[in-house]
């Protein structure tokens, strides 16, 4: 990653997963004290409000539409003449939700489990989603898993969370192959509670097992 430490850092506030019609602030930070930035979209439909524009640290985008979904980068500069732009930032994926009906989310063996018991979350819908995405405490995470047709006519994905330690609130989203950053409405939230011999807890949840390869869109 040549020159990586000089690159700006692009992030989203409050989240890179944005409901349709909502707003998101894109922030470009740096170690070099850049005072102005340009922002561009790498894929999908161009966003006219960004074209040939210069920003100071941040830009509020919205109300977002499906056209805003995609991969963004920023470049920084000091306002010299002529302006010299930095190397591009890290890529930032903006996901737009609320574009399809919500899937349903359930837990096996159930939403209340004993400490150490294996938990699997199943996301399903009658809509022919290609992919499901799991969210925890309102934050989007990987893993994402392909939807598999099931015998009852739904399309389903099973997320193994591994042995339960703490509880948490989960939702899931569906998406299609040709628009991977355009997601459905969230499922109804599912509260997973963990009971132990000494106490029960549904607060202070730990992250899902790293074995599932979970990554955040936003740091």
């Amino acid at each position: 990653h040549e020159g990586g430490q000089d690159k700006p850092l692009l992030s989203a506030w409050p989240s890179a997963v944005v409901p349709r019609g909502g707003h998101v602030t894109l922030l470009c930070r740096s170690r070099l004290g850049f005072t102005i930035f340009s922002l561009y979209k790498e894929d999908g439909v161009p966003v006219p409000e960004l074209y040939n524009k210069i920003f100071w640290k941040s830009i509020l985008m919205g109300p977002v539409t499906p056209a805003h979904a995609g991969t963004y980068r920023c470049r920084g500069s000091h306002p010299r003449s002529p302006i010299e732009w930095s190397a591009p930032s890290n890529p930032l994926v903006i996901v737009v939700t609320g574009l399809f009906g919500k899937p349903s989310l359930s837990a096996q063996p159930g939403p209340t489990v004993r400490t150490g018991e294996n938990v699997t979350l199943s996301c399903s819908s009658r809509s022919s989603f290609d992919m499901y995405h799991l969210s925890r405490e309102g934050r989007a995470h990987e893993p994402r898993l392909p939807a598999v047709p099931s015998v009852n006519g739904t399309f389903q994905a099973d997320f193994p969370l591994g042995p339960a330690t703490h509880g948490g609130t989960y939702t899931c989203f569906g998406s299609l192959h040709d628009s991977p950053y355009e997601w459905s409405d969230p499922s109804d939230p599912l509260l997973v509670s963990v009971t132990g011999n000494s106490s029960s807890s549904s607060s202070s949840p730990t992250e899902p097992s790293s074995k599932t390869g979970i990554r955040r869109h936003l740091h």
Epitope: E2, G3, G4, Q5, D6, L9, W13, P14, T25, L27, R29, S30, R31, L32, G33, F34, K57, H219
Partner: antibody, heavy 116, light 107 residues
Framework: QIQLVQSGPELKKPGETVKISCKAS????????MHWVKQAPGKGLKWMGW????????TYADDFKGRFAFSLETSATTAYLQINNLKNEDTATYFC??????????WGQGTTLTVS | DIQMTQSPASLSASVGETVTITCRTS??????LAWYQQKQGKSPQLLVY???TLVEGVPSRFSGSGSGTQFSVKINSLQPEDFGNYYC?????????FGGGTKLEIK
Amino acid sequence: QIQLVQSGPELKKPGETVKISCKASGYTFTDYSMHWVKQAPGKGLKWMGWINTETGGPTYADDFKGRFAFSLETSATTAYLQINNLKNEDTATYFCSRDVDLYFDYWGQGTTLTVS
Amino acid sequence: DIQMTQSPASLSASVGETVTITCRTSENIYSYLAWYQQKQGKSPQLLVYNAKTLVEGVPSRFSGSGSGTQFSVKINSLQPEDFGNYYCQHHYGIPFTFGGGTKLEIK
């Protein structure tokens, strides 16, 4: 495990030069920038600047331009802070720290410099 | 430059008590705030980043909160090893600045 190990305490006279080292281990040295922080006796923390461990390019905070120089010996995974023409007000503990997403996750143990 | 105002400057508390230290910034830094603990004669140790993300290994009695310009770190059920100095730092971009520090002492 990740460690930043700094050189030992220094006692110098005004006008002299000091060079403090910070040896990094346990990670890929060129993947993370290195910062320097000053703490005067009984005072708080003051950011001095940073060095790009890929390119060797330094960036100095406004109060540390002129007499201060950051450098690297990449093959030895070591960063250096040199202060020229020492003054009494340079008496402090100096820390190196590793930067991840613009905050500092690992710090050296500090090098105490006394100018007297 | 972003100014960081930390309060209180010093604080006396007993083991088992709960304390809160606050940090105010001169401009919106969203959630880009870190907290450090420094014990006498030692280097600072990162406790919290992104305003509320606890570093692995830091006891759960510590919690960070806030966004925008108002932030705090709360320590529940103080333990003897929690006493020392605490500093906030914005990680929004250079120049980095630290709060003036809070000295947490045993009552």
